[in-house]
């Protein structure tokens, strides 16, 4: 959490941003609040990103004023404007880049003041794993995939049963390149499996940490999984 | 497109005083601190002052302190400096120049430069 | 002050070389709050500067990249893998981790 003051000269206001990940070729969010102000017209939000001419994006006077919007964020960002009056300047960014990855102000200004905040933004590709049985194996076998990630993860096996056990052994990850020629599909497969046991593949780069749980007993298969982002700080 | 337009050469008498300008265009003016730098001929640049056009809060350099005094007229997205006393050490080209990005008040690096403002100061 | 030291003060090359500009700082340019504020600007003949690298290696936007800064602390250099004619003029390094800002005397990049 980053909280940003205003600087000198009338009032400073309170503006605070959480660090966050945007899952390329999908839809992000950068989040920012303020302290509201009574009247909508008096509210300016500008969102500047690091090494950025133009602005990423500006909304005053009720309204979003793109015309010094910097080109390669063109048709790519909103406001939720109706959440600006209570103090949302949150920003949605359209078809997440790689490049969009760096450190973003939001730069707030109303009748109270101004105040601003930054916030790092990564970017990369993040998936559910699935882990099911593979019966076409020779022996008991799991095979872990995801569709999409980058930066490239590691994928570390481990069991309920054996806890601290390296699998390391009886395990092959393999990253296969997707068409896009950027994210990469993650197979991981795991060898000499045994019944009634929780298996879980966990999938971390340093933006996103998946894990894909499979419990196989001999009457049924029960699966679950979960993705938590890496480094959603505040300021 | 974002620029930094500085108003035309000056000839002055030595002891007198000379007022620069830049205006700037295609970005919101007061969000973006403006600098002021100093180039004597054929030397390297020397940072003068900047002035937050939201405002007018300055910051001098100690060197030119008492010589260069900086104001702005938001309505019309413009940055001054004012020199007085002027002799031939301040013969040189002024830069006015956009603040980039900053984080606090440390990143002073400058995205944006106007084309320069060249002071003659001769009898 | 920060004094800043720029070596060589003039650079020969032809186009397609790789030039290398040092720039050293009289004095720690790591911020307490972690950063290094040393950026290098391009100044061509006749024109103002322009910023190539902020903060130590981050290229500005429309920088080609063949520009590539890096160093820490005291020592900094500014590479340009293959000298292209747009690339000849002075480079400076600049600090604004201590108050005053401060810039290098600048290097003169011209053909042999």
């Known amino acids: 959490l980053i909280i940003g003051f205003g600087i000198s000269g009338r009032h400073s206001i309170t503006v605070t941003t959480v660090a966050s990940a945007g899952n390329i070729g999908e839809d992000g969010i950068l989040s920012c609040t303020f302290e509201p102000d009574i009247k909508l017209s008096d509210i300016v939000i500008q969102w500047l990103k690091e090494g950025v001419l133009g602005l990423v994006h500006e909304f005053k006077e009720g309204k979003d004023e793109l015309s010094e919007q910097d080109e390669m964020f063109r048709g790519r960002t909103a406001v939720f404007a109706d959440q600006v009056i209570v103090g949302n300047a949150s920003l949605r960014l359209k078809n997440v880049q790689l490049t969009d990855a760096g450190t973003y102000k939001c730069y707030i200004i109303t009748s109270k003041g101004k105040g601003n905040a930054n916030l790092e933004y990564k970017t990369g590709a993040f998936s559910m794993p699935e882990v099911n049985v593979d019966y076409n194996a020779s022996s008991e076998t799991l095979r872990c995939e995801a569709p999409r990630w980058f930066p490239q993860p590691t994928v570390v096996w481990a069991s309920q049963v054996d806890q601290g056990a390296n699998f390391s052994e009886v395990s092959n990850t393999s990253f296969e390149l997707n068409s896009e020629n950027v994210t990469m599909k993650v197979v991981s497969v795991l060898y000499n499996v045994t019944i009634n046991n929780t298996y879980s593949c966990m999938i971390e780069n340093d933006i996103a940490k998946a894990t894909g749980d499979i419990k196989v007993t001999e009457s049924e298969i029960k699966r679950r999984s979960h993705l938590q982002l890496l480094n959603s700080k505040a300021s | 497109e974002i620029q930094l337009q500085q108003s035309g050469p000056e000839l002055v008498m030595p002891g007198a005083s000379v007022k620069v300008s830049c205006t700037a265009s295609?970005?919101?003016?007061?969000?973006?601190?403006m600098y002021w730098v100093k180039q004597s001929h054929g030397k390297s640049l020397e940072w003068i002052a900047y002035i937050d056009p939201y405002n007018g809060g300055t910051s001098y350099n100690q060197k030119f302190k008492g010589k260069a005094t900086l104001t702005v007229d938001k309505s019309s997205s413009t940055a001054y400096m004012h020199l007085n006393s002027l002799t031939s050490e301040d013969s040189a080209v002024y830069y006015c120049?956009?603040?980039?990005?900053?984080?606090?008040?440390?990143?002073?690096?400058?995205?944006?430069w106007g084309a320069g403002t060249t002071v003659t100061v001769s009898s | 002050d920060v004094v800043m030291t720029q070596t060589p003060l003039s650079l020969p090359v032809s186009l397609g070389d790789q030039a290398s500009i040092s720039c050293r700082s009289s004095q720690s340019l790591v911020h307490s709050g972690g950063n290094t504020y040393l950026h290098w600007y391009l100044q061509k003949p006749g024109q103002s500067p322009k910023l190539l690298i902020y903060?130590?290696?981050n290229r500005f936007s429309g920088v080609p990249d063949r520009f590539s800064g890096s160093g820490s602390g005291t020592d900094f250099t500014l590479k340009i893998s293959r000298v292209e004619a747009e690339d000849l003029g002075v480079y400076f390094c600049?600090?604004?981790?201590?108050?005053?800002?401060?810039f290098g005397a600048g290097t003169k990049l011209e053909l042999k």
């Open positions: 600049s600090q604004s981790t201590h108050v005053p800002l401060t």
């Open positions: 120049a956009r603040s980039g990005f900053y984080d606090g008040y440390y990143a002073w690096y400058f995205d944006v």
């Open positions: 295609g970005y919101p003016f007061t969000t973006y601190n």
């Open positions: 903060k130590v290696s």
